[in-house]
């Protein structure tokens, strides 16, 4: 009864924003759903969540620590995160729940996506001391 989800295993981010796509083995337009993105090996932090169905675009809400938005088509939910920092580097898991009508359905836990935020190094040109 579980839905399968495909995520990219690794996203390396040079800028401070990223788009993470979650592709599901189920038609998202069939039922009212709740799509969420979790951070951490134990999915401790709900980063972003949105509800949607075939008649309206979801409003995505983010955890206070994150800025997020999202979009979906009939098989993919895409989360966009911005203002990311080095300490946001972690593993992220997509989750989908089909809330109503019954039966309730959700996805098998995927292997997740490691989002690696690269540190920005500022290059300072040092002038040699004058003798």
């Amino acid at each position: 009864n579980k839905i399968l989800v495909k995520q990219s295993p690794l996203l390396v981010v040079d800028s401070n924003e990223v788009s993470l796509s979650c592709r599901y083995s189920y038609n998202l337009l069939a039922k009212e759903f709740r799509a969420s993105l979790y951070k951490g090996v134990n999915s401790d932090v709900e980063v972003c969540v949105g509800n949607g169905n075939f008649t309206y675009q979801p409003q995505f809400r983010s955890n206070a620590e994150f800025n997020c938005d999202g979009d979906f088509d009939n098989e993919t939910v895409t989360f966009r995160l911005w203002n990311l920092h080095v300490n946001h580097t972690d593993i992220y898991f997509c989750k989908i729940e089909f809330m109503y009508p019954p039966p309730y359905l959700d996805n098998e836990r995927s292997n997740g996506t490691i989002i690696h935020i690269k540190e920005k190094h500022l290059c300072h040109t040092q002038s040699s001391p004058k003798l």
Epitope: N1, E32, V49, N51, N53, T55, Y100, P101, P102, P103
Partner: antibody, heavy 116, light 107 residues
Framework: EVQLLESGGGLVQPGGSLRLSCAAS????????MSWVRQAPGKGLEWVSA????????YYADSVKGRFTISRDNSKNTLYLQMNSLRAEDTAVYYC?????????WGQGTLVTVSS | DIQMTQSPSSLSASVGDRVTITCRAS??????LNWYQQKPGKAPKLLIY???SLQSGVPSRFSGSGSGTDFTLTISSLQPEDFATYYC?????????FGQGTKVEIK
């Protein structure tokens, strides 16, 4: 803490109308389907109606179809049940319930008595 | 609609007894079966969801099993506060339907 608080019950004559309300707090109301479940005196639980999180889809038991209307106001975190053409057999305690995988939270119920 | 049949409709038991209540669906509902406890004058309380998952805060003496059409709620050692009415409910196909209830009384 999740809380559901029903109101609007009372005594009404057959053929009359009532509007029940259920004020929700402690969870993201718009994310969850909500239901009304009733219990006639000394009887078991009977599902009455449900509405999806967005309010876009509604469902009714055959016994109330065409007479009851479920709705929700997500901006006010409130669920409603408009009951028209009430009959003696609608006499019951009406519970609102949050529906996730199951009915995981219930209100305390409001009594509707239909009698002349 | 899917019909849910509980048995027995009532039973008498003593504190410490192992109690088993069964619920049968008129067609397969996979594991979409939930159990509730209700005490007089109170709202129902979720005990078990998805056939065997214990709801947070519910004592571990309650357990559920089964899939398809046949399900069981077991109370391993009945406590004084467990005397109540128990309902099964299927969530596999709309509309949601409940069993008729099983009243657990003191012997």
């Amino acid at each position: 803490e999740v809380q559901l608080l029903e109101s609007g019950g009372g005594l009404v004559q057959p053929g009359g109308s009532l509007r029940l309300s259920c004020a929700a707090s402690g969870f993201t109301f718009s994310s969850y389907a909500m239901s009304w479940v009733r219990q006639a005196p000394g009887k078991g639980l009977e599902w009455v109606s449900a509405i999806s999180g967005s309010g876009g889809s509604t469902y009714y038991a055959d016994s109330v179809k065409g007479r009851f209307t479920i709705s929700r106001d997500n901006s006010k975190n409130t669920l409603y049940l408009q009951m028209n053409s009430l009959r003696a057999e609608d006499t019951a305690v009406y519970y609102c319930a949050k529906r996730y995988i199951a009915f995981d939270y219930w209100g305390q119920g409001t009594l509707v008595t239909v009698s002349s | 609609d899917i019909q849910m049949t509980q048995s027995p409709s009532s039973l008498s038991a003593s504190v410490g007894d192992r109690v088993t209540i069964t619920c049968r669906a008129s067609q397969s509902i996979s594991s979409y079966l939930n159990w509730y406890q209700q005490k007089p004058g109170k709202a129902p309380k979720l005990l078990i969801y998805a056939a065997s998952s214990l709801q947070s805060g519910v004592p571990s003496r309650f357990s559920g099993s089964g899939s398809g059409t046949d399900f069981t709620l077991t109370i391993s050692s009945l406590q004084p506060e467990d005397f109540a009415t128990y309902y099964c409910q299927q969530g596999g196909m709309p509309p949601d339907t409940f069993g008729q209830g099983t009243k657990v009384e003191i012997k």
